[in-house]
Interface confidence: low
């Protein structure tokens, strides 16, 4: 408890202050003094409020008394009630706390009485004559909000000194009522004044944030910087933002330029507007609006395919006439069977590999620990969260924490167990036109894809073949994922997988081969169900391994965590093929490219707002154009965006009920005991 001092002092909480004024006043004078400052005599109605009063009053003089806001009119005794007929100066008798010094007495009470609090001991309440001047009084001030006391910063000469709206000056406050002023003195001689003001958000806060004594260090509050505070050798302070963010106009906050950017597909921080829009592989910026992306018709490029070319949204495919098969470059055609037998044997060897060799050096995801569990006909997607960057916000997730259930055709065969061995870029022969996508074959060192030849395109398959990947994966000589730009990368592929002839169907593998797209080689291999004649093959895409950080795999842009076509998710398959693709899964890393979703046939929204109804798949052997369209997935909202600087708004003094009129004239005729404290 604080010792008694002759100076006024106060104790403030988030919504009210108690102030002690050690000045001799009558009850009416004390009430008026509190009212003039915008408050009222103290009304400690709860044990918590009484505790704050106790700590404020501390140890006062042995016989000292302080007026509180309780008075009783003549002949209004009610000894059986908690306040004994006394009324708070706010005009009511509500209370959850009393602290009378003496028991209630029966009998008449002819005179008006007022209550005072003992300045020492247990701060009990005594009743006595309202016209006596006592040692001091306690005021109470209510307000709409309070600002926390300012932390001491490096460079400050000492703690801030505060002036409250009720004219108390101190550096000891823990909370400062709305309308208070903080004066900060800096060691360099300068100073700053801050006002506790209303914020546009509705609360209250200091009118200035950030280093109050700039050039004098970062201090315990990180120099007011949202991300990183840098203290220069000369003592100057500057704020820096994490990669992908830029410093806001206030010099302290960090903002994500791509958060509000109107890019249709990909956004990268930088450029004159603070961001630049990019398009995915197979798309280019629209001429009339660089924020939009339009499909590139690669088939218009001379020589893009040796024989036939099919363009589709986001890519194209080369294929060959009957009796020819597509070569490994994905462009050229050669007579069927020229290289088939050995390649088929190589492929069979690859597929039957037990998966234990070379895993450490070839697979960037070798220690993925995830498992899959599927119900027949239902794919469960558990949302994963991006890593924590220590930032003051984290992205919202739609239906955060609830598994997203997609209703799929319930007549599938039972799901297979997840593959655990190394994942090879192997391809299985089929008797249907399984065409391989090559997203940019005209570039040098294009991906040499494995090939599936087809002899009679319109026919249904004779056997239930195993699924072939839409685009096989790359295997890199350095055993690492390459850096890939947002648009049309030069893909440094150094491995040519085997070629399988239609005349040598491969055996069913012990596990299914992965589907890995050319545009995003770090995709994780899917789990595939076997395929029946005339049905779609459903591709299961497991979650991206949590430890796999794609941050080093692409240009340093960034990406929303829950949007379609995230790196490592999208498998580019044309409608010509028999693959029916599942929606992409969310990654759990803030990866390379900041993407916004695009409607596409093979790309449903990341999380539908309601479950998709079961749909019976149809044969699409002759379909070239996309047959489904999906609405754009909602943008992930951002939290923690700093509100604009507020205009200081000063408080208005609230009016409270006046106490009952007090007898100010002489009290002749009243008993002698009315002028004493009992």
């Amino acid at each position: 408890q604080v010792p008694w001092t002759p100076e006024p002092r106060a104790a403030c909480g988030p919504s009210s202050c108690y102030a002690l004024f050690p000045r001799r006043r009558t009850f009416l004078e004390a009430w008026r003094a509190c009212r003039e400052l915008g408050g009222n005599l103290a009304t400690p109605r709860t044990p918590e409020e009484a505790q704050r009063v106790d700590s404020l009053v501390g140890v006062g003089p042995a016989n000292g008394l302080l007026w509180i806001g309780l008075q009783r009119q003549a002949r209004q005794c009610q000894p059986q009630r908690p306040l004994r007929g006394f009324i708070w100066t706010t005009g009511d008798q509500d209370t959850a706390f009393t602290n009378w010094a003496q028991p209630a007495t029966e009998g008449p009470c002819p005179a008006q009485r007022c209550a005072a609090l003992e300045a020492s001991g247990e701060h009990r309440w005594l009743e006595g004559s309202c016209t006596l001047a006592v040692d001091g009084y306690l005021c109470q001030f209510g307000f709409e909000g309070a600002c926390p006391a300012l932390p001491l910063e490096v460079g400050q000469a000492g703690p801030a000194v505060y002036t409250t709206p009720f004219n108390l000056v101190s550096s000891e406050f823990e909370w400062l009522p709305f309308g208070s002023v903080a004066a900060v003195q800096c060691q360099a001689g300068r100073g700053a004044s801050l006002l506790c003001v209303k914020q546009p958000s509705g609360g209250v806060g200091w009118s200035q944030t950030g280093p109050l004594c700039p050039g004098t260090g970062c201090g315990p509050d990180n120099g007011g910087c949202e991300h990183e505070c840098v203290e220069e050798v000369d003592g100057a302070v500057s704020c820096r933002c994490s990669e992908g963010f830029r410093l806001a106009a206030d010099g302290h906050s960090c903002e994500d330029p791509c958060a509000q950017a109107p890019c249709e597909q990909q956004c990268e921080p930088g450029g004159p507007q603070g961001y630049s829009c990019h398009c995915r592989l197979g798309f280019r910026p629209a001429e009339d609006d660089p924020h939009r992306c339009v499909d590139t018709d690669e088939c218009q490029i001379a020589g893009v395919c040796q024989q036939m070319c099919v363009n589709y949204v986001g890519g194209f495919e080369c294929y060959c006439s009957e009796g020819h098969e597509l070569e490994a470059d994905g462009i050229s055609c050669s007579p069927a069977g020229a290289m088939g037998a050995q390649a088929s044997q190589d492929l069979r060897d690859e597929l039957l590999d037990d998966g234990e060799e070379g895993e450490d050096e070839e697979e960037p995801w070798e220690d993925f620990d995830g498992t899959w569990t599927e119900e027949q006909g239902i794919l469960w997607l558990a949302p994963t969260h991006p890593p924590d960057f220590g930032l003051p916000y984290r992205p919202n997730f739609p239906q955060d924490g609830e598994p997203q259930r997609l209703h799929l055709e319930p007549t599938w065969p039972p799901p297979l167990s997840a593959p655990r061995g190394p994942y090879h870029s192997s391809v299985v022969s089929a008797t249907r036109p399984m065409v391989i996508s090559a997203t940019r074959p005209t570039l040098p060192s294009a991906h040499k894809t494995s090939v599936i030849s087809a002899t009679r395109p319109p026919l249904s398959p004779v056997h239930p073949p195993a699924m072939a990947p839409a685009t096989p994966p790359a295997v890199f000589s350095e055993h690492q994922i390459p850096k890939i730009k947002a648009n049309y990368p030069d893909l440094p592929f150094g491995h040519k997988p085997g070629i399988t002839s239609a005349t040598h169907p491969a055996r069913s593998p012990p596990y299914q081969p992965p589907i890995i797209s050319t545009n995003y080689p770090q995709v994780f291999p899917p789990h595939q169900a076997p395929m029946s004649p005339d049905t779609h093959t459903i591709t299961y895409l497991p979650p991206v391994p949590p430890h796999l950080d794609p941050g080093d795999t692409t240009s340093k842009a960034h990406q929303h965590p829950l949007l379609p076509d995230a790196p490592g998710i999208r498998t580019q398959a044309p409608q010509l093929s028999v693959s029916a693709l599942q929606p992409p899964l969310p990654t759990n890393s803030r990866s390379s490219v900041h993407e916004t979703p695009v409607p596409a046939a093979n790309q449903p929204p990341a999380f539908p707002s309601s479950p998709l109804p079961p749909q019976r798949p149809t044969n699409q052997t002759s379909s070239i154009s996309p047959t489904h369209s999906y609405s754009r997935a909602p943008l992930v909202p951002r939290e923690g965006v700093p509100s604009p600087k507020s205009v200081p708004q000063l408080p208005s003094v609230p009016s409270t009920a006046a106490p009952t009129a007090l007898a100010e004239s002489g009290l002749a005729g009243q008993s002698q005991r009315d002028d004493r404290w009992l």
Epitope: G13, E174, W175, G217, G390
Partner: antibody, heavy 121, light 111 residues
Framework: QVQLVESGPGLVKPSQTLSLTCTVS??????????WSWIRQHPGKGLEWIGY???????YYNPSLKSRVTISVDTSKNQFSLKLSSVTAADTAVYYC?????????????WGQGTTVTVSS | QSVLTQPPSVSGAPGQRVTISCTGS?????????VRWYQQLPGTAPKLLIY???NRPSGVPDRFSGSKSGTSASLAITGLQTEDEADYYC???????????FGGGTKLTVL
Amino acid sequence: QVQLVESGPGLVKPSQTLSLTCTVSGGSISSGGYYWSWIRQHPGKGLEWIGYIYYSGSTYYNPSLKSRVTISVDTSKNQFSLKLSSVTAADTAVYYCARVRGRSATYFDYWGQGTTVTVSS
Amino acid sequence: QSVLTQPPSVSGAPGQRVTISCTGSSSNIGAGYDVRWYQQLPGTAPKLLIYANNNRPSGVPDRFSGSKSGTSASLAITGLQTEDEADYYCQSYDISLSGSLFGGGTKLTVL
């Protein structure tokens, strides 16, 4: 990955000065944006913040220990040190060094393994 | 003397949910300062579990969550596991200390 390692004598005589050093690897003390702190834990008891230092030398100390504590930094060695004078048996504890980050410079994201200091004659 | 008050011990059976409270004052939690939680397994240094009231560093399971209201905060652990048996400390900034303040610690026992 930032690593912190405490070093110093495990036994100190009463009234003497306890001296500990924390060596930081995997990151530079001078990089800015971080404070470097000492925390102690009495046997079977809770954690007590001793103080922290910025690479520029700005220090903040627990008021209850302020009169006896000095924390210093040597950026050339990527080290910071604790000196606690006039020790008594009540200063027997496990002493941890830690990196501090965040707006209020108050959360400890990397800790040393701790070193036990016994004050005894 | 500023303090953050925690219950000395809590317990729960595997799979259950337990909460640990941390009560401060208007000079620390009530002043708007963030609350952090640390887990200290026997014989090891404390490890950051929750920062900024309710955020988990990477690697911390989502079974751990934090919340803050007024002058107090709490740590909730759902799906209790035997490896969660440890001491848990809350921590905040304190304006009167101009520095960090730890709670007294809570020993969690998994029955």
